[in-house]
Interface confidence: low
Protein backbone atom coordinates (compact mmCIF):
# COMPACT_ATOMS: atom_id res chain seq x y z
CA UNK A 1 0.00 0.00 0.00
CA UNK A 2 0.88 3.69 0.15
CA UNK A 3 2.66 3.31 3.49
CA UNK A 4 5.14 0.85 1.97
CA UNK A 5 5.78 3.27 -0.86
CA UNK A 6 6.52 6.06 1.62
CA UNK A 7 8.82 3.75 3.58
CA UNK A 8 10.71 2.76 0.45
CA UNK A 9 11.48 6.40 -0.24
CA UNK A 10 12.84 6.97 3.27
CA UNK A 11 10.14 9.54 3.69
CA UNK A 12 10.36 11.55 6.87
CA UNK A 13 7.21 11.46 8.99
CA UNK A 14 6.30 14.33 11.28
CA UNK A 15 3.26 14.16 13.51
CA UNK A 16 1.79 17.50 14.44
CA UNK A 17 -0.55 17.44 17.19
CA UNK A 18 -8.57 33.98 6.95
CA UNK A 19 -6.44 35.11 5.15
CA UNK A 20 -8.61 37.11 2.68
CA UNK A 21 -7.45 38.31 -0.68
CA UNK A 22 -7.29 42.05 -1.21
CA UNK A 23 -10.39 42.90 -3.22
CA UNK A 24 -10.43 45.79 -5.61
CA UNK A 25 -12.43 46.61 -8.69
CA UNK A 26 -10.49 47.69 -11.73
CA UNK A 27 -12.47 49.59 -14.28
CA UNK A 28 -10.52 48.37 -17.27
CA UNK A 29 -9.96 50.62 -20.25
CA UNK A 30 -12.42 51.18 -23.03
CA UNK A 31 -11.19 50.59 -26.56
CA UNK A 32 -13.16 51.01 -29.78
CA UNK A 33 -13.94 47.87 -31.72
CA UNK A 34 -15.22 47.40 -35.22
CA UNK A 35 -15.49 50.04 -37.94
CA UNK A 36 -18.00 52.66 -39.04
CA UNK A 37 -18.97 56.06 -37.77
CA UNK A 38 -20.30 54.75 -34.43
CA UNK A 39 -17.56 52.72 -32.72
CA UNK A 40 -18.61 49.84 -30.47
CA UNK A 41 -16.75 49.98 -27.17
CA UNK A 42 -15.32 46.94 -25.48
CA UNK A 43 -13.80 46.59 -22.06
CA UNK A 44 -10.06 45.93 -22.17
CA UNK A 45 -8.73 43.85 -19.30
CA UNK A 46 -5.19 42.87 -18.28
CA UNK A 47 -5.68 39.11 -18.46
CA UNK A 48 -6.04 36.72 -21.39
CA UNK A 49 -9.46 36.48 -23.01
CA UNK A 50 -11.92 33.60 -22.96
CA UNK A 51 -10.44 30.32 -24.19
CA UNK A 52 -11.15 29.71 -27.88
CA UNK A 53 -14.20 27.52 -28.47
CA UNK A 54 -15.11 27.80 -24.79
CA UNK A 55 -18.79 26.75 -25.11
CA UNK A 56 -17.91 23.79 -27.32
CA UNK A 57 -15.12 22.75 -24.94
CA UNK A 58 -17.36 22.83 -21.85
CA UNK A 59 -20.11 20.89 -23.62
CA UNK A 60 -17.68 18.31 -25.02
CA UNK A 61 -15.99 17.83 -21.65
CA UNK A 62 -19.36 17.39 -19.97
CA UNK A 63 -20.43 14.72 -22.47
CA UNK A 64 -17.10 12.92 -22.11
CA UNK A 65 -17.21 13.05 -18.30
CA UNK A 66 -20.76 11.73 -18.06
CA UNK A 67 -19.92 8.89 -20.44
CA UNK A 68 -16.91 7.84 -18.34
CA UNK A 69 -18.65 8.22 -14.96
CA UNK A 70 -21.86 6.16 -14.85
CA UNK A 71 -23.03 7.82 -11.63
CA UNK A 72 -23.27 11.13 -13.54
CA UNK A 73 -25.16 9.78 -16.56
CA UNK A 74 -28.32 11.54 -15.42
CA UNK A 75 -26.66 14.94 -16.00
CA UNK A 76 -28.08 16.92 -18.92
CA UNK A 77 -25.03 18.62 -20.42
CA UNK A 78 -27.06 21.24 -22.25
CA UNK A 79 -28.55 22.32 -18.91
CA UNK A 80 -25.05 22.34 -17.42
CA UNK A 81 -23.83 24.64 -20.17
CA UNK A 82 -26.89 26.89 -19.78
CA UNK A 83 -26.21 27.17 -16.04
CA UNK A 84 -22.50 27.83 -16.63
CA UNK A 85 -23.30 30.50 -19.20
CA UNK A 86 -25.91 32.06 -16.95
CA UNK A 87 -23.32 32.58 -14.23
CA UNK A 88 -21.33 35.18 -16.18
CA UNK A 89 -23.05 36.20 -19.44
CA UNK A 90 -24.43 39.78 -19.39
CA UNK A 91 -22.81 40.40 -16.01
CA UNK A 92 -20.00 42.80 -15.20
CA UNK A 93 -16.92 40.56 -15.02
CA UNK A 94 -15.73 42.32 -11.85
CA UNK A 95 -19.00 41.79 -10.03
CA UNK A 96 -19.48 38.02 -10.05
CA UNK A 97 -20.64 36.33 -6.84
CA UNK A 98 -20.76 32.75 -5.57
CA UNK A 99 -24.53 33.01 -5.88
CA UNK A 100 -24.20 33.42 -9.65
CA UNK A 101 -22.76 29.91 -9.80
CA UNK A 102 -25.39 28.18 -7.66
CA UNK A 103 -27.52 26.81 -10.55
CA UNK A 104 -24.31 25.22 -11.90
CA UNK A 105 -23.32 23.91 -8.44
CA UNK A 106 -26.74 22.32 -8.15
CA UNK A 107 -26.48 20.51 -11.48
CA UNK A 108 -22.94 19.40 -10.63
CA UNK A 109 -23.79 17.85 -7.27
CA UNK A 110 -21.72 14.69 -7.14
CA UNK A 111 -20.78 11.92 -4.78
CA UNK A 112 -17.05 11.37 -4.29
CA UNK A 113 -15.65 9.53 -1.26
CA UNK A 114 -15.14 12.26 1.31
CA UNK A 115 -12.17 10.40 2.86
CA UNK A 116 -10.32 10.12 -0.47
CA UNK A 117 -9.79 13.79 -1.24
CA UNK A 118 -6.45 15.10 -2.48
CA UNK A 119 -5.93 18.85 -2.40
CA UNK A 120 -2.94 20.45 -4.10
CA UNK A 121 -1.17 23.78 -4.33
CA UNK A 122 1.02 24.84 -7.22
CA UNK A 123 1.73 21.25 -8.26
CA UNK A 124 -1.36 20.34 -10.24
CA UNK A 125 0.24 18.06 -12.82
CA UNK A 126 1.74 15.65 -10.30
CA UNK A 127 -1.50 15.62 -8.27
CA UNK A 128 -3.41 14.67 -11.41
CA UNK A 129 -0.87 12.04 -12.43
CA UNK A 130 -1.24 10.57 -8.95
CA UNK A 131 -5.05 10.33 -9.04
CA UNK A 132 -4.90 8.86 -12.54
CA UNK A 133 -2.95 5.98 -11.04
CA UNK A 134 -4.48 5.90 -7.56
CA UNK A 135 -8.01 5.81 -8.98
CA UNK A 136 -9.80 5.83 -5.64
CA UNK A 137 -8.47 9.30 -4.77
CA UNK A 138 -9.88 12.51 -6.18
CA UNK A 139 -8.70 16.04 -6.84
CA UNK A 140 -11.21 18.78 -7.52
CA UNK A 141 -10.44 18.40 -11.22
CA UNK A 142 -11.56 14.75 -11.05
CA UNK A 143 -15.09 15.98 -10.28
CA UNK A 144 -17.44 17.10 -13.04
CA UNK A 145 -17.26 20.81 -12.23
CA UNK A 146 -13.48 20.84 -11.83
CA UNK A 147 -13.04 18.82 -15.00
CA UNK A 148 -15.23 21.22 -17.00
CA UNK A 149 -13.27 24.33 -16.07
CA UNK A 150 -9.70 23.06 -15.70
CA UNK A 151 -7.22 25.34 -17.52
CA UNK A 152 -9.99 27.43 -19.10
CA UNK A 153 -10.60 31.19 -18.94
CA UNK A 154 -13.95 32.88 -19.47
CA UNK A 155 -15.76 36.16 -19.00
CA UNK A 156 -18.60 38.15 -20.48
CA UNK A 157 -19.61 41.77 -20.75
CA UNK A 158 -22.11 43.80 -18.79
CA UNK A 159 -25.48 44.04 -20.55
CA UNK A 160 -24.49 42.11 -23.68
CA UNK A 161 -24.82 38.41 -24.34
CA UNK A 162 -21.32 38.24 -25.80
CA UNK A 163 -18.40 36.22 -24.50
CA UNK A 164 -15.21 38.33 -24.34
CA UNK A 165 -12.53 36.51 -26.30
CA UNK A 166 -10.17 39.50 -26.28
CA UNK A 167 -9.42 39.91 -22.57
CA UNK A 168 -10.68 39.02 -19.10
CA UNK A 169 -9.96 40.59 -15.70
CA UNK A 170 -6.68 39.68 -14.08
CA UNK A 171 -7.05 38.78 -10.40
CA UNK A 172 -4.34 41.20 -9.23
CA UNK A 173 -4.38 43.96 -11.82
CA UNK A 174 -8.12 44.24 -12.37
CA UNK A 175 -10.39 42.61 -9.79
CA UNK A 176 -10.74 39.48 -7.68
CA UNK A 177 -14.47 38.96 -8.18
CA UNK A 178 -14.03 37.83 -11.77
CA UNK A 179 -15.83 34.79 -13.28
CA UNK A 180 -12.86 32.41 -13.13
CA UNK A 181 -11.66 33.31 -9.62
CA UNK A 182 -15.15 33.19 -8.13
CA UNK A 183 -15.84 29.82 -9.79
CA UNK A 184 -12.71 28.23 -8.30
CA UNK A 185 -13.34 29.83 -4.92
CA UNK A 186 -16.88 28.42 -4.90
CA UNK A 187 -16.08 24.86 -5.98
CA UNK A 188 -12.92 24.76 -3.83
CA UNK A 189 -14.84 25.81 -0.74
CA UNK A 190 -17.53 23.19 -1.29
CA UNK A 191 -14.92 20.52 -2.06
CA UNK A 192 -13.05 21.26 1.17
CA UNK A 193 -16.30 21.33 3.16
CA UNK A 194 -17.14 17.88 1.87
CA UNK A 195 -13.85 16.33 2.98
CA UNK A 196 -13.64 13.99 5.95
CA UNK A 197 -11.29 11.70 7.87
CA UNK A 198 -7.73 12.12 6.54
CA UNK A 199 -7.33 14.81 3.88
CA UNK A 200 -4.15 14.88 1.81
CA UNK A 201 -2.56 17.92 0.21
CA UNK A 202 0.32 17.92 -2.27
CA UNK A 203 2.63 20.95 -1.96
CA UNK A 204 5.46 22.11 -4.21
CA UNK A 205 8.77 21.95 -2.32
CA UNK A 206 10.57 23.84 -5.10
CA UNK A 207 8.77 27.11 -4.44
CA UNK A 208 9.99 29.79 -2.05
CA UNK A 209 6.65 29.57 -0.24
CA UNK A 210 5.87 25.86 0.00
CA UNK A 211 2.64 26.80 1.74
CA UNK A 212 1.24 30.07 0.43
CA UNK A 213 -1.58 31.72 2.36
CA UNK A 214 -2.61 33.49 -0.86
CA UNK A 215 -3.15 30.30 -2.85
CA UNK A 216 -6.61 28.75 -3.23
CA UNK A 217 -5.51 26.04 -0.83
CA UNK A 218 -4.22 28.56 1.71
CA UNK A 219 -7.03 31.10 1.48
CA UNK A 220 -10.07 28.91 0.82
CA UNK A 221 -9.63 25.19 1.34
CA UNK A 222 -7.67 25.29 4.63
CA UNK A 223 -10.35 27.44 6.22
CA UNK A 224 -13.26 25.33 5.02
CA UNK A 225 -12.15 21.91 6.22
CA UNK A 226 -14.72 20.94 8.85
CA UNK A 227 -13.04 20.08 12.19
CA UNK A 228 -15.93 17.86 13.26
CA UNK A 229 -15.43 15.75 10.13
CA UNK A 230 -11.72 16.04 9.30
CA UNK A 231 -9.36 14.27 11.68
CA UNK A 232 -6.01 14.96 9.99
CA UNK A 233 -4.54 17.05 7.19
CA UNK A 234 -1.54 15.23 5.77
CA UNK A 235 0.84 17.33 3.65
CA UNK A 236 3.04 15.72 1.01
CA UNK A 237 5.93 18.04 0.20
CA UNK A 238 7.25 17.25 -3.27
CA UNK A 239 11.00 17.74 -3.76
CA UNK A 240 12.31 19.10 -7.05
CA UNK A 241 16.02 18.29 -7.07
CA UNK A 242 17.32 14.72 -7.14
CA UNK A 243 20.00 15.43 -4.54
CA UNK A 244 17.67 17.39 -2.28
CA UNK A 245 17.64 15.53 1.03
CA UNK A 246 16.51 18.44 3.22
CA UNK A 247 13.58 17.94 5.53
CA UNK A 248 11.15 20.39 3.97
CA UNK A 249 8.57 19.54 6.62
CA UNK A 250 10.61 21.87 8.86
CA UNK A 251 10.11 24.78 6.43
CA UNK A 252 8.71 27.89 8.18
CA UNK A 253 5.69 27.99 5.86
CA UNK A 254 4.86 24.36 6.70
CA UNK A 255 5.08 25.28 10.38
CA UNK A 256 2.69 28.13 9.63
CA UNK A 257 0.29 25.67 7.98
CA UNK A 258 0.58 23.35 10.98
CA UNK A 259 -0.25 26.24 13.28
CA UNK A 260 -3.34 27.24 11.27
CA UNK A 261 -4.59 23.66 11.09
CA UNK A 262 -3.92 22.91 14.76
CA UNK A 263 -5.82 26.03 15.81
CA UNK A 264 -8.78 24.63 13.89
CA UNK A 265 -8.63 21.43 16.01
CA UNK A 266 -7.42 19.31 13.10
CA UNK A 267 -4.29 17.18 13.44
CA UNK A 268 -1.43 17.82 11.04
CA UNK A 269 1.19 15.51 9.61
CA UNK A 270 3.81 16.01 6.92
CA UNK A 271 5.83 13.76 4.63
CA UNK A 272 8.70 14.53 2.29
CA UNK A 273 8.42 13.02 -1.19
CA UNK A 274 12.10 13.06 -2.16
CA UNK A 275 11.67 11.25 -5.47
CA UNK A 276 8.33 12.09 -7.11
CA UNK A 277 9.16 9.97 -10.17
CA UNK A 278 9.91 6.99 -7.94
CA UNK A 279 6.82 7.76 -5.86
CA UNK A 280 4.54 7.61 -8.91
CA UNK A 281 6.25 4.48 -10.18
CA UNK A 282 5.68 2.76 -6.85
CA UNK A 283 2.03 3.83 -6.77
CA UNK A 284 1.70 2.19 -10.21
CA UNK A 285 3.65 -0.94 -9.26
CA UNK A 286 3.65 -1.37 -5.48
CA UNK A 287 4.95 -4.94 -5.86
CA UNK A 288 8.19 -3.70 -7.43
CA UNK A 289 11.14 -4.85 -5.28
CA UNK A 290 12.57 -1.34 -5.04
CA UNK A 291 9.29 -0.17 -3.50
CA UNK A 292 9.40 -2.50 -0.53
CA UNK A 293 13.05 -2.04 0.40
CA UNK A 294 14.71 1.18 1.48
CA UNK A 295 16.48 3.04 -1.31
Amino acid sequence: GLNDIFEAQKIEWHEGSHHHHHHHHGSGSLVPRGSGSVPRWRQQWSGPGTTKRFPETVLARCVKYTEIHPEMRHVDCQSVWDAFKGAFISKHPCNITEEDYQPLMKLGTQTVPCNKILLWSRIKDLAHQFTQVQRDMFTLEDTLLGYLADDLTWCGEFNTSKINYQSCPDWRKDCSNNPVSVFWKTVSRRFAEAACDVVHVMLNGSRSKIFDKNSTFGSVEVHNLQPEKVQTLEAWVIHGGREDSRDLCQDPTIKELESIISKRNIQFSCKNIYRPDKFLQCVKNPEDSSCTSEI
Epitope: E98, D100, T109, P113, N115, R190, K229
Partner: antibody
Framework: QVQLKESGPGLLLSSETLSLTCTVS????????VSWVRQLPGRGLEWMGR???????DYNSDLKSRLSISRDIAKSQVFLKMSNLKTEDTGTYYC?????????????WGPGTMVTVSS | QFTLTQPKSVSGSLRSTITIPCERS????????VTWYQQHLGRPPLNVIY?????PSEVSDRFSGSIDSSSNSASLTITNLQMDDEADYFC??????????FGGGTKVTVL
Protein backbone atom coordinates in the same frame (compact mmCIF):
# COMPACT_ATOMS: atom_id res chain seq x y z
CA GLN B 1 -21.39 28.90 17.17
CA VAL B 2 -23.91 27.68 14.62
CA GLN B 3 -27.55 28.10 15.67
CA LEU B 4 -30.95 27.96 13.99
CA LYS B 5 -34.25 28.89 15.62
CA GLU B 6 -37.77 28.57 14.24
CA SER B 7 -40.55 30.98 15.20
CA GLY B 8 -44.15 31.55 14.22
CA PRO B 9 -47.75 31.07 15.38
CA GLY B 10 -48.46 27.82 17.19
CA LEU B 11 -52.19 27.63 16.44
CA LEU B 12 -53.92 28.13 13.11
CA LEU B 13 -57.24 27.29 11.50
CA SER B 14 -57.86 25.10 8.47
CA SER B 15 -57.46 26.91 5.12
CA GLU B 16 -55.22 29.58 6.72
CA THR B 17 -51.62 30.21 5.67
CA LEU B 18 -48.71 29.17 7.89
CA SER B 19 -45.80 31.63 8.08
CA LEU B 20 -42.64 30.49 9.86
CA THR B 21 -39.26 32.20 10.24
CA CYS B 22 -35.91 30.50 10.73
CA THR B 23 -33.30 32.85 12.19
CA VAL B 24 -29.71 31.63 11.86
CA SER B 25 -26.42 32.70 13.42
CA UNK B 26 -22.83 31.52 13.18
CA UNK B 27 -22.94 31.07 9.41
CA UNK B 28 -24.04 32.92 6.29
CA UNK B 29 -27.03 32.09 4.11
CA UNK B 30 -24.76 32.81 1.13
CA UNK B 31 -22.54 29.88 2.15
CA UNK B 32 -24.96 27.16 3.22
CA UNK B 33 -28.29 25.83 2.04
CA VAL B 34 -31.15 25.77 4.57
CA SER B 35 -34.03 23.29 4.39
CA TRP B 36 -37.38 23.00 6.10
CA VAL B 37 -38.26 19.57 7.48
CA ARG B 38 -41.45 18.65 9.32
CA GLN B 39 -42.49 15.80 11.56
CA LEU B 40 -46.16 14.92 11.84
CA PRO B 41 -47.40 13.13 15.00
CA GLY B 42 -46.38 9.48 15.06
CA ARG B 43 -44.82 9.88 11.62
CA GLY B 44 -41.32 10.20 10.25
CA LEU B 45 -39.43 13.20 8.96
CA GLU B 46 -40.56 14.86 5.73
CA TRP B 47 -38.34 17.18 3.73
CA MET B 48 -40.37 20.20 2.59
CA GLY B 49 -37.91 22.27 0.57
CA ARG B 50 -34.74 24.34 0.62
CA UNK B 51 -33.28 27.66 -0.32
CA UNK B 52 -29.96 27.49 -2.13
CA UNK B 53 -27.18 29.93 -1.39
CA UNK B 54 -27.92 31.63 -4.69
CA UNK B 55 -31.56 32.11 -3.70
CA UNK B 56 -33.01 29.32 -5.85
CA UNK B 57 -35.59 27.12 -4.17
CA ASP B 58 -36.51 23.43 -4.39
CA TYR B 59 -39.75 21.95 -3.09
CA ASN B 60 -41.07 18.52 -2.19
CA SER B 61 -43.32 17.69 -5.16
CA ASP B 62 -46.20 16.65 -2.86
CA LEU B 63 -46.22 20.07 -1.19
CA LYS B 64 -45.06 22.28 -4.06
CA SER B 65 -48.46 23.80 -4.86
CA ARG B 66 -48.90 25.10 -1.29
CA LEU B 67 -45.33 26.02 -0.43
CA SER B 68 -43.13 29.09 -0.74
CA ILE B 69 -39.63 29.49 0.73
CA SER B 70 -37.71 32.76 0.71
CA ARG B 71 -34.96 34.49 2.70
CA ASP B 72 -33.56 37.79 3.90
CA ILE B 73 -29.76 37.59 3.82
CA ALA B 74 -29.24 40.80 5.78
CA LYS B 75 -31.41 39.54 8.64
CA SER B 76 -30.09 35.95 8.36
CA GLN B 77 -33.63 34.66 8.10
CA VAL B 78 -35.32 31.99 6.00
CA PHE B 79 -39.10 32.03 5.62
CA LEU B 80 -41.64 29.28 5.02
CA LYS B 81 -45.17 29.95 3.82
CA MET B 82 -47.67 27.11 3.43
CA SER B 83 -51.16 27.92 2.25
CA ASN B 84 -54.51 26.12 2.53
CA LEU B 85 -53.65 24.40 5.81
CA LYS B 86 -55.28 21.11 6.77
CA THR B 87 -55.55 19.48 10.19
CA GLU B 88 -53.05 16.86 8.89
CA ASP B 89 -50.41 19.59 8.74
CA THR B 90 -50.25 19.59 12.54
CA GLY B 91 -46.73 18.74 13.69
CA THR B 92 -43.26 20.02 14.51
CA TYR B 93 -41.51 22.13 11.89
CA TYR B 94 -37.70 22.30 11.79
CA CYS B 95 -35.20 24.30 9.79
CA UNK B 96 -31.84 22.62 9.21
CA UNK B 97 -28.49 23.53 7.67
CA UNK B 98 -27.12 21.33 4.92
CA UNK B 99 -24.11 21.42 2.73
CA UNK B 100 -23.44 19.51 -0.42
CA UNK B 101 -20.82 18.98 -3.08
CA UNK B 102 -20.69 15.30 -2.33
CA UNK B 103 -23.61 14.66 -0.10
CA UNK B 104 -26.59 16.24 1.56
CA UNK B 105 -26.42 15.95 5.28
CA UNK B 106 -28.04 18.15 7.93
CA UNK B 107 -25.40 18.95 10.51
CA UNK B 108 -27.32 21.55 12.51
CA TRP B 109 -31.06 21.71 13.30
CA GLY B 110 -33.27 24.22 15.04
CA PRO B 111 -35.16 23.05 18.15
CA GLY B 112 -38.38 22.93 16.15
CA THR B 113 -41.66 24.77 16.50
CA MET B 114 -44.97 23.05 17.15
CA VAL B 115 -47.81 23.96 14.79
CA THR B 116 -51.41 22.93 15.49
CA VAL B 117 -54.06 23.26 12.81
CA SER B 118 -57.62 23.00 14.07
CA SER B 119 -60.84 22.88 12.12
CA GLN C 1 -38.06 8.76 -6.97
CA PHE C 2 -36.94 5.94 -4.69
CA THR C 3 -38.03 5.21 -1.13
CA LEU C 4 -36.01 4.17 1.93
CA THR C 5 -37.58 1.41 4.02
CA GLN C 6 -36.70 0.79 7.68
CA PRO C 7 -38.19 -1.66 10.19
CA LYS C 8 -40.66 -0.01 12.56
CA SER C 9 -38.78 -1.22 15.63
CA VAL C 10 -35.60 -2.98 16.72
CA SER C 11 -34.81 -4.02 20.27
CA GLY C 12 -31.72 -5.29 22.04
CA SER C 13 -30.56 -5.97 25.55
CA LEU C 14 -28.16 -3.74 27.42
CA ARG C 15 -24.55 -4.02 26.11
CA SER C 16 -25.66 -6.04 23.06
CA THR C 17 -25.22 -5.10 19.37
CA ILE C 18 -28.08 -4.13 17.07
CA THR C 19 -28.22 -3.31 13.36
CA ILE C 20 -30.86 -1.14 11.69
CA PRO C 21 -31.26 -1.73 7.94
CA CYS C 22 -32.41 0.90 5.43
CA GLU C 23 -33.35 -0.51 2.03
CA ARG C 24 -33.40 1.59 -1.14
CA SER C 25 -36.31 0.70 -3.43
CA UNK C 26 -34.71 1.55 -6.80
CA UNK C 27 -31.33 2.64 -8.08
CA UNK C 28 -28.10 1.62 -6.36
CA UNK C 29 -27.61 2.29 -2.65
CA UNK C 30 -24.06 3.45 -3.51
CA UNK C 31 -25.25 6.13 -5.93
CA UNK C 32 -25.86 8.69 -3.21
CA UNK C 33 -24.51 8.99 0.30
CA VAL C 34 -26.64 7.87 3.25
CA THR C 35 -26.89 9.83 6.50
CA TRP C 36 -28.25 8.55 9.83
CA TYR C 37 -29.96 10.61 12.54
CA GLN C 38 -30.82 9.82 16.14
CA GLN C 39 -33.86 11.53 17.62
CA HIS C 40 -34.79 11.48 21.28
CA LEU C 41 -38.38 12.31 22.18
CA GLY C 42 -39.06 16.04 21.97
CA ARG C 43 -35.63 16.83 20.53
CA PRO C 44 -34.45 17.65 16.99
CA PRO C 45 -32.60 14.94 15.06
CA LEU C 46 -28.86 14.53 15.64
CA ASN C 47 -26.49 13.46 12.86
CA VAL C 48 -24.69 10.26 13.96
CA ILE C 49 -23.39 9.00 10.60
CA TYR C 50 -22.85 10.88 7.33
CA UNK C 51 -21.40 9.87 3.95
CA UNK C 52 -22.37 6.20 4.47
CA UNK C 53 -19.84 5.36 7.17
CA UNK C 54 -18.33 8.55 8.56
CA UNK C 55 -18.93 9.51 12.18
CA PRO C 56 -18.90 13.12 13.47
CA SER C 57 -16.12 13.52 16.04
CA GLU C 58 -18.52 14.13 18.93
CA VAL C 59 -20.45 10.88 18.31
CA SER C 60 -19.49 7.69 20.17
CA ASP C 61 -17.49 5.10 18.23
CA ARG C 62 -20.16 2.57 19.20
CA PHE C 63 -22.08 3.88 16.17
CA SER C 64 -21.02 2.73 12.71
CA GLY C 65 -22.55 2.85 9.24
CA SER C 66 -22.12 0.68 6.18
CA ILE C 67 -23.71 -0.05 2.83
CA ASP C 68 -24.30 -3.43 1.23
CA SER C 69 -24.84 -3.48 -2.53
CA SER C 70 -26.10 -7.08 -2.54
CA SER C 71 -29.15 -6.13 -0.45
CA ASN C 72 -29.17 -2.54 -1.77
CA SER C 73 -29.26 -1.38 1.84
CA ALA C 74 -27.49 0.86 4.27
CA SER C 75 -27.12 -0.19 7.91
CA LEU C 76 -26.54 1.53 11.22
CA THR C 77 -24.89 -0.66 13.84
CA ILE C 78 -24.83 0.20 17.54
CA THR C 79 -22.51 -1.87 19.72
CA ASN C 80 -22.48 -2.07 23.52
CA LEU C 81 -26.08 -0.81 23.59
CA GLN C 82 -26.78 1.76 26.33
CA MET C 83 -30.05 3.01 27.84
CA ASP C 84 -29.44 6.43 26.29
CA ASP C 85 -29.47 4.82 22.81
CA GLU C 86 -33.23 4.33 23.18
CA ALA C 87 -34.51 6.72 20.49
CA ASP C 88 -35.84 6.90 16.94
CA TYR C 89 -33.31 6.46 14.12
CA PHE C 90 -33.81 7.77 10.59
CA CYS C 91 -31.79 7.10 7.44
CA UNK C 92 -31.68 9.79 4.78
CA UNK C 93 -30.39 10.10 1.23
CA UNK C 94 -31.13 12.24 -1.83
CA UNK C 95 -32.03 11.65 -5.46
CA UNK C 96 -30.42 13.01 -8.63
CA UNK C 97 -32.45 16.23 -8.29
CA UNK C 98 -30.97 16.60 -4.79
CA UNK C 99 -34.43 16.09 -3.26
CA UNK C 100 -34.01 14.83 0.30
CA UNK C 101 -35.51 11.44 1.11
CA PHE C 102 -35.96 10.10 4.66
CA GLY C 103 -36.63 6.57 5.77
CA GLY C 104 -39.73 6.01 7.89
CA GLY C 105 -37.74 5.70 11.11
CA THR C 106 -36.94 2.85 13.50
CA LYS C 107 -37.76 2.88 17.22
CA VAL C 108 -34.91 1.32 19.21
CA THR C 109 -35.82 -0.18 22.56
CA VAL C 110 -33.23 -1.28 25.12
CA LEU C 111 -34.42 -4.31 27.08
Amino acid sequence: QVQLKESGPGLLLSSETLSLTCTVSGFSLTSYEVSWVRQLPGRGLEWMGRVWIGGDTDYNSDLKSRLSISRDIAKSQVFLKMSNLKTEDTGTYYCARAYGFNYWSFDFWGPGTMVTVSS
Amino acid sequence: QFTLTQPKSVSGSLRSTITIPCERSSGDIGDNYVTWYQQHLGRPPLNVIYADDQRPSEVSDRFSGSIDSSSNSASLTITNLQMDDEADYFCQSYDSNTDIIFGGGTKVTVL
